[in-house]
């Protein structure tokens, strides 16, 4: 469906508000260091240009592609070379290479200061003084820190952000109303960003076949009553949406996502009984609701899979005729029967089934060869079941902070070359799996835990790709998307690692420790723990626990002292000496 002017088409489809928001997100995700005002200026220029194209689609430049229009606009930024260095070289390229070049320069860990939350009264004043600017600033600040954030979903977050301020700035106790809502938006936003980053990594590093397989499994779990053809149509449409968003085509992505939501709501009867309440909502809320919708109930009369996929004499014939369709149907049938399995496990089973068919369909007696294929699934199923059960036991025994510490020690011993901030961030997030998943009933634990771990480990892979330091991490990240988590689980102590020399400065602390929030204190202590393990990778848990307990006692003592700085100066070296002796 071609249009004379793509920019006019998208402006009309999306409306001015969403158009401007999406262009701001796109520009902020590409030029992450540019000041807010610069982006607003660029967005306003693009918007004015779009309006001229709406008025006359034949006007000059209106026939240009969105990449050409947006790329040209980005390349007008005067400080491109000084601010972004070699990214400025992208501007010498023609489309589509120029856009690919911009995409490659997206920075998953931009050197930006952490967002500081002002006083509630200051925020409410800013909101009332200029609501539009206030909300644009939110889009800009989130987008530049999360360059793969799912753009239409970010508009939904911004709408919730606006609603929180509109409600709470009128409340008697503004802070009590607003702060929990902002905390929730922050935590949900970080989770949403990480989930989308995995989708983009899946598409960009492993191709759309990998993403489609993921989508078949997930949608079949969600919509077990839907026919395979229906699931396939949804998968095709969803793949297009995410391919566009991950490729920086945010206007097309948002437009196609709205079309997909419309289609799902018009075809509820053939998809799922759970869509009703989503479909009454306005667009942004509706799309979010559909994406998060709970699994429908499984049909009661599903037959055994063995008949079609093991016992049938036509297995090899059906496989040979259309391999991907046959495997897709197998994945669909398995997934709709197993909402209790993680998507990654389902994909491993499909991979194992494919490998068996590849081997057996070339054998003298194929049926005899693949007759026991379902038995071979058992160890693949037991591995994540055991992993989740053991980790939840450990979480329940230790509590979140100490569980994170256990993971910190384990991952530092596995990949000690990885930077300390990355190990702390990733291990803290791995540790959150306990609170998130262990309280759930047995049937929901594995999908919650393993699919969450996949998202967290993708963050490790993305950060490591930027600064590669470990062949083991590179191997686990690049060899197989579905086997990333088992690959990391199977890593053992790195015997080749040369312990880091002891640096007293790393273990020198000051009175500013006492004013930190509980979370910041934990991060400081966990940073010290990683450094300890890097220095003494063969230290036992008891030794490390002893040092950490002494550390907590030393900090607590000095934070209670009248002259805190003097206490840190005096007790610090004693703590360091005692720790070195304990680990000797």
């Amino acid at each position: 469906d071609t249009h004379k002017s793509e920019v006019a088409h998208r402006f009309k489809d999306l409306g001015e508000e969403h158009f401007k928001g999406l262009v701001l997100v796109a520009f902020s995700q590409y030029l992450q260091q540019c000041p807010f005002e610069e982006h607003v200026k660029l967005v306003n220029e693009v918007t004015e240009f779009a309006k001229t194209c709406v008025a006359d689609e034949s006007a000059e430049n209106c026939d240009k592609s969105l990449h050409t229009l947006f790329g040209d606009k980005l390349c007008t930024v005067a400080t491109l070379r000084e601010t972004y260095g070699e990214m400025a070289d992208c501007c010498a390229k023609q489309e589509p290479e120029r856009n690919e070049c911009f995409l490659q320069h997206k920075d998953d860990n931009p050197n930006l200061p952490p967002l500081v939350r002002p006083e509630v009264d200051v925020m409410c004043t800013a909101f009332h003084d200029n609501e539009a600017t206030f909300l644009k600033k939110y889009l800009y600040e989130v987008a530049r820190r999360h360059p793969y954030f799912y753009a239409p979903e970010l508009l939904f977050f911004a709408a919730r952000y606006k609603a929180a301020f509109a409600e709470c700035c009128q409340a008697a106790d503004k802070a009590a109303c607003l702060l929990p809502k902002l905390d929730e938006l922050r935590d949900e936003g970080k989770a949403s960003s990480a989930k989308q980053r995995l989708k983009c990594a899946s598409l960009q590093k492993f191709g759309d076949r990998a993403f489609k397989a993921w989508a078949v499994a997930r949608l079949s779990q969600k919509f077990p009553k839907a026919e395979f053809a229906e699931v396939s149509k949804l998968v095709t449409d969803l793949t297009k949406v995410h391919t566009e968003c991950c490729h920086g085509d945010l206007l097309e992505c948002a437009d196609d996502r709205a079309d997909l939501a419309k289609y799902m709501c018009e075809n509820q009867d053939s998809i799922s009984s759970k869509l009703k309440e989503c479909c009454d909502k306005p667009l942004l809320e509706k799309s979010h609701c559909l994406a998060e919708v709970e699994n429908d109930e499984m049909p009661a009369d599903l037959p055994s899979l063995a008949a079609d996929y093991v016992e049938s004499k036509d297995v090899c014939k059906n496989y040979a005729e259309a391999k991907d369709v046959f495997l897709g149907m197998f994945l669909y049938e398995y997934a709709r029967r197993h909402p209790d399995y993680s998507v990654m496990l389902l994909l491993r089973l499909a991979k194992a089934y494919e490998a068996t068919l590849e081997k057996c369909c070339a054998a003298a007696d194929p049926h005899e060869c693949y007759a026991k294929v379902f038995d071979e699934f058992q160890p693949l199923v037991e591995e994540p079941q055991n992993l989740v059960k053991q980790n939840c036991e450990l979480f329940e025994q230790l509590g979140e902070y100490k569980f994170q510490n256990a993971l910190l020690v384990r991952y530092t011993k596995k990949v000690p070359q990885v930077s300390t901030p990355t190990l702390v961030e990733v291990s803290r997030n791995l540790g959150k799996v306990g609170a998130k998943c262990c309280k759930l009933p047995e049937a929901k634990r594995m999908p919650c835990a393993e699919d969450y771990l996949s998202v967290v480990l993708n963050r490790l892979c993305v950060l490591h790709e930027k600064t590669p330091v470990s062949e083991k991490v590179t191997k686990c990240c690049t060899e197989s998307l579905v086997n990333r988590r088992p690959c990391f689980s199977a890593l053992e102590l790195d015997e080749a690692y040369v312990p880091k020399a002891f640096n007293a400065e790393t273990f020198t602390f000051h009175a500013d420790m006492c004013t930190l929030s509980e979370k910041e204190k934990q991060v400081k202590k966990q940073t010290a723990l990683v450094e300890l393990v890097k220095h003494k990778p063969k230290a036992t848990k008891e030794q490390l626990k002893g040092v950490m307990d002494n550390f907590a006692a030393f900090v607590e003592k000095c934070c209670k002292a009248d002259d805190k700085e003097a206490c840190f100066a005096e007790e610090g070296p004693k703590f360091v000496a005692a720790s070195q002796a304990a680990l000797a």
């Epitope: 992993l387 059960k389 450990l394 025994q397 011993k413 102590l493 848990k541 626990k545």
Partner: nanobody, 123 residues
């Protein structure tokens, strides 16, 4: 320091049984996850089974499930491995391991190890 000593290994015919013991000294084992690993000649050390602090949870490698049983007696500071229906492929040196937080199959999760006891299953 926790010390572990395995015993009970030996030569047995396929289909036979053995019971391995792991006696701990130096510390009470009640705070430790206990496990058995094995290492066949020329192969990596592999997880066999583990038991949590209370004995309420046990885990087994797929290859030994239904044939081997792990148990612990915290009062005697000892862990046991009952091995039934032994197969030639079970031939290996069997190691007892202990850790505060040990997680199943990861060799690196365990801080304390015994010297091992040889189990040979003849066909």
């Amino acid at each position: 320091q926790l010390q572990l000593v395995e015993s009970g290994g030996g030569l047995v015919q396929a289909g036979g049984s053995l019971r391995l013991s792991c006696a701990a000294s130096g510390r009470a084992i009640s705070s430790y996850v206990m496990a058995w690993f094995r290492q066949a000649p020329g192969k990596e050390r592999e997880f066999v089974t583990s038991i949590n602090w209370s004995g309420g949870s046990t885990y087994y490698a797929h290859s030994v499930k239904g044939r081997f049983t792990i148990s612990r007696d915290n009062a005697k500071n000892t862990v046991y491995l009952q091995m039934n229906t032994l197969k030639p492929e079970d031939t290996a040196v069997y190691y007892c391991a202990a850790d505060l937080y040990g997680l199943g199959y990861e060799v690196m999760s365990y801080d304390y190890w015994g010297q091992g006891t040889q189990v040979t299953v003849s066909s």
